[in-house]
Amino acid sequence: QTSVSPSKVILPRGGSVLVTCSTSCDQPKLLGIETPLPKKELLLPGNNRKVYELSNVQEDSQPMCYSNCPDGQSTAKTFLTVYWTPERVELAPLPSWQPVGKNLTLRCQVEGGAPRANLTVVLLRGEKELKREPAVGEPAEVTTTVLVRRDHHGANFSCRTELDLRPQGLELFENTSAPYQLQTFVLPATPPQLVSPRVLEVDTQGTVVCSLDGLFPVSEAQVHLALGDQRLNPTVTYGNDSFSAKASVSVTAEDEGTQRLTCAVILGNQSQETLQTVTIYSFPAPNVILTKPEVSEGTEVTVKCEAHPRAKVTLNGVPAQPLGPRAQLLLKATPEDNGRSFSCSATLEVAGQLIHKNQTRELRVLYGPRLDERDCPGNWTWPENSQQTPMCQAWGNPLPELKCLKDGTFPLPIGESVTVTRDLEGTYLCRARSTQGEVTRKVTVNVLSPRYE
């Protein structure tokens, strides 16, 4: 009778084991072990027992002890089970950004590992088990489908293998894959809203606003604003699930024409874009030309208005004849024209919009001086000792200086409150003088003495 000890062994791959072969007869003709494994016999006293060290056990094996006794030949097998953890535990690569609402398939691949009967594959979100299956096939593959939700944002998905050798008196061996961090996002199907001037004047600044609602996570959204080749640098304000990007755009003569304004929002691996056309135009204010801005009364004055070649002008509300970029009017300067404004209004159509520009010039008419009866009465009669204010207004442009003197030596205080005395009586020569000349007018002051009352 041949026996083997131990009859069953579980050992790590590449490990060694001592196997004892024994026989029941005292003098066996033959006692040995049959195995492809490297073996080494350990010397022991006696003939009916042999100990072998089997080394570098790479896979399951069944070494067989045999003996030849007088009563016949017999054999006994020992069962070596090799265990090892998987060489590769991996989640199939996925884009890190996933849109909310999408079905995400997680695939875990496991290479190696034994004994397979004790090997389980677990798919996890954080610490929560999503699926648990025995490892089948080489490589073993376990898949599960996850419906991506907003609250999955930032969650770590992983795959774990469990080699459970606790029933064999060993431990539970775990291997975990590198985690896959899920970034979830919501980019609405609606394009961003772009608010900007449809037309923009050369050498001015405009404001462009691009906004979008219903984004998640809004802080991760990238906004690109551009006018033609000019990248704009917006200031972005974030709400709970919205943003508003505001940028100033400056245009020069080189930008003149139709330009494309774009706003692109990039979130995750998706983007939404809005395009708009902006017409950049040059339209200087019309020019109002007076033959001379300052003229003397009676001078012929030509007022011209000139504007952009495609503009239509009106001068003081009167359209150009024929309708076009030039208008003019002729007038003979009168004192009433002093300070008169000549306003030229030019209208230009740009991309269906009417643009208006104005320019105003003022005419100065030099006239006078004037002294007349209405504003400088020739006769005053005042009671003696009364308070009176002599009034005499000279007209002209420039405003004349006025002096009223009696006998060239006694001034009459124009516009001042005076006490009427006999000294005040007499004839005064009032002189109004300006750069335009001098006029005189005689004013008589009569003083009524109390005794005549």
Epitope: D407, G408, T409
Partner: antibody, heavy 115, light 110 residues
């Protein structure tokens, strides 16, 4: 406007200073006489108006007489004393004041009263 | 009578400084006041008329103000050429020419 007739005069005598004008008419301008004793301030003697009416300082009445022709204005000093030693100025329009064109001063003529 | 009183009688001022001369009339002369500048051996030079109007050719550093009985001549950013005697004159009553001029203010520039 230019003064003449100044010089050395004996106390108690008579002296007439003449102011000759050109470029304007005395019928439309008043003329005044102002004097300044050595190291002292300015003082008005009197004024003749465009109508020939005269106005004098109270201290000058009786001893000073202002008169005019079409182109001259005279200042007659009777019985001068050493106190009357001064530079005498003729002034156009002393009371008119459009600008300096109306305030014309002559260069002055020096009168020295000494025995 | 319209007597004119001028203060101070003399004043010393540094180049670049400001000097203020006051003139008081014994009764209202409205704005009929003139200012003159006189340098030794020269005739008076007309500076200001109607209390505040600057005569042509006079630098804007000279400024007149006041009306009624109180008047002021201010010379700002004084220059050495401003050393002279300054007189005020009432130009209102020709029938009262006694003391029509102020006593004068000598301005010395250091």
């Amino acid at each position: 406007v230019e003064e003449s007739g100044g010089g050395l005069v004996k106390p108690g005598g008579t002296l007439t200073l003449t102011c000759t004008v050109s470029g304007f008419s005395l019928s439309t301008h008043a003329m005044g006489w102002v004097r300044q004793a050595p190291g002292k301030g300015l003082e008005y003697i009197g004024i003749i108006g465009s109508s020939d009416r005269t106005y004098y300082a109270s201290w000058a009445k009786g001893r000073f007489t202002i008169s005019k022709t079409s182109t001259t204005v005279d200042l007659k000093i009777t019985s001068p004393t050493t106190e009357d030693t001064a530079t005498y100025f003729c002034v156009r329009d002393p009371y008119d004041s459009f600008d300096d064109g109306y305030r014309l001063w002559g260069p002055g003529t020096l009168v020295t009263v000494s025995s | 009578a319209y007597d004119m009183t001028q203060t101070p009688a003399s004043v010393e001022v540094a180049v670049g400084g400001t000097v203020t001369i006051k003139c008081q009339a014994s009764q209202s002369i409205y704005s009929y006041l003139s200012w003159y500048q006189q340098k030794p051996g020269q005739r008076p030079k007309f500076l200001i008329y109607d209390a505040s109007k600057v005569a042509s050719g006079v630098p804007s550093r000279f400024k007149g103000s006041g009306s009624g009985t109180e008047f002021t001549l201010t010379i700002s950013a004084v220059q050495s050429d401003d050393a002279a005697t300054y007189y005020c004159q009432q130009a209102y009553s020709s029938s009262n020419v006694d003391n029509a001029f102020g006593g004068g203010t000598e301005v010395m520039v250091k």
